[in-house]
């Protein structure tokens, strides 16, 4: 292969000018002609100067996998996915998330000590003696002397399955 300049790409034993971001090569250059570039079609992109014959497919942000689109795809930049509401990222991959997980659900007998964020789970805490939380959604446990047995019983933390991006 020939050693081409940074703004060129190899074609056989020759070098041709690259296409700009948002364009792909429709026809390689010839002796008398430059590279023929064609715009990327909707749903595809190329972010850099390139010698590609096809644009790259935009990634899809699948809500079923706990994802939402945080940046729409353009012809010059791929879409970015973030975690959907109620989910947080457990593995980061560059500028996007490799795995989302649903927030833990605080159980009866627990309070929400700290709400979940984009990168952190909900933090649950057991209610202190003499207080209760009937559904685990409260930020403060309620004082009560007539709790039924099932409310006094300490419940384990909620669980939910991993959602991957």
């Amino acid at each position: 292969l020939p050693s081409c300049k940074e703004d060129e790409y190899p074609v056989g034993s020759e070098c041709c000018p690259k296409c700009g971001p948002g364009f792909h090569v429709r026809q390689a250059c010839g002796e008398q002609t430059g590279t023929v570039c064609e715009p990327c079609s909707p749903g595809t992109y190329i972010a850099h100067f390139n010698g590609l014959s096809k644009c790259l497919q935009c990634q899809m942000c699948d809500p079923a996998m706990g994802l939402r689109t945080s940046r729409n795809c353009s012809t010059t930049a791929n879409a970015l996915c973030g975690c959907s509401p109620g989910h947080f990222c457990i593995i980061q991959d560059g500028d996007h998330c490799a795995a989302c997980r649903a927030y833990a659900t605080s159980s009866p007998g627990q309070r929400v000590q700290k709400g979940g964020t984009e990168s952190q789970d909900t933090l649950c805490q057991n209610c202190p003696p003499g207080t209760f939380s009937s559904n685990g959604t409260l930020e403060e446990c309620q004082h009560g002397t007539k709790c039924s047995k099932w409310l006094v019983t300490e419940a384990g933390p909620g669980t939910s399955s991993f959602r991957w991006v």
């Epitope: 790259l56 497919q57 990634q59 899809m60 942000c61 699948d62 996998m65 994802l67 996915c81 947080f88 990222c89 457990i90 593995i91 980061q92 991959d93 560059g94 490799a98 795995a99 997980r101 990168s119 952190q120 789970d121 933090l123 991993f162 991957w164 991006v165």
Partner: antibody, heavy 115, light 107 residues
Framework: EVKLVESGGGLVQPGGSLRLSCATS????????MSWVRQTPGKALEWLGF??????????EYSVSVKGRFTISRDNSQSILYLQMNTLRVEDSATYYC??????WGQGTTLTVSS | DIQMTQSPASQSASLGESVTITCLAS??????LAWYQQKPGKSPQLLIY???SLADGVPSRFSGSGSGTKFSFKISSLQAEDFVSYYC?????????FGGGTKLEIK
């Protein structure tokens, strides 16, 4: 039930090649990033790389120690992950795990590189 | 690459005692940290993810804390089956590096 089963380990001479396989089941393979991790006899764990999921065009990422020598690929129709290892060195001797990091790992397959 | 420094490399303790293992990251990693347990001849098993969240089916005697660069992993009342090896792993940026491991031994 999620299952990952590695195979293909064995004894190879320095400079040789080998391909490891990881058969998976119990989840939608195309939705997940899949990784290879190795553990040397000295017990250190080393992340080798991953192949992204369908949404991310199955692109790959490698650690510096194996980049250019190892290639991760996947057969999505059979739900199999591969690790092609070329120009093997004595220091590549280890137990190799495929993983759906962080929650599911295979049982591992052992590679010995020795003359 | 982000270096993960895990300490101690080994620790002796008695049944019923509490132990704490520390992992220091060479740069800030938010809460993108996992802790694994590994039994002899077996693959690592996830105990904690996102620094503090307990993986499904893991007993509540295991807990994780910390964010940024300093992380701790605690076993509150050691059982016989806990005397094995433990590893941290950062999941902030590739390569997803591991700590050197901690081997727990019975006193």
């Amino acid at each position: 039930e999620v299952k990952l089963v590695e195979s293909g380990g064995g004894l190879v001479q320095p400079g040789g090649s080998l391909r490891l396989s990881c058969a998976t089941s119990g989840f939608t393979f195309t939705d997940y990033y899949m990784s290879w991790v190795r553990q040397t006899p000295g017990k250190a764990l080393e992340w080798l790389g991953f192949i992204r999921n369908q949404a991310n065009a199955y692109t790959t990422e490698y650690s510096v120690s194996v980049k250019g020598r190892f290639t991760i690929s996947r057969d999505n129709s059979q739900s199999i992950l591969y690790l092609q290892m070329n120009t093997l060195r004595v220091e590549d001797s280890a137990t190799y795990y495929c993983a759906r990091v962080p929650d599911y790992w295979g049982q591992g397959t052992t590679l010995t590189v020795s003359s | 690459d982000i270096q993960m420094t895990q300490s101690p490399a080994s620790q002796s303790a008695s049944l019923g005692e509490s132990v704490t293992i520390t992992c220091l990251a060479s740069q800030t990693i938010g809460t993108w940290l996992a802790w694994y347990q590994q039994k002899p001849g077996k693959s690592p098993q996830l105990l904690i993810y996102a620094a503090t969240s307990l993986a499904d089916g893991v007993p509540s005697r295991f807990s994780g804390s910390g964010s940024g660069t300093k992380f701790s992993f605690k076993i509150s009342s050691l059982q016989a089956e806990d005397f094995v090896s433990y590893y941290c792993q950062q999941l902030h940026s590739t390569p997803y590096t591991f700590g050197g491991g901690t081997k727990l031994e019975i006193k």
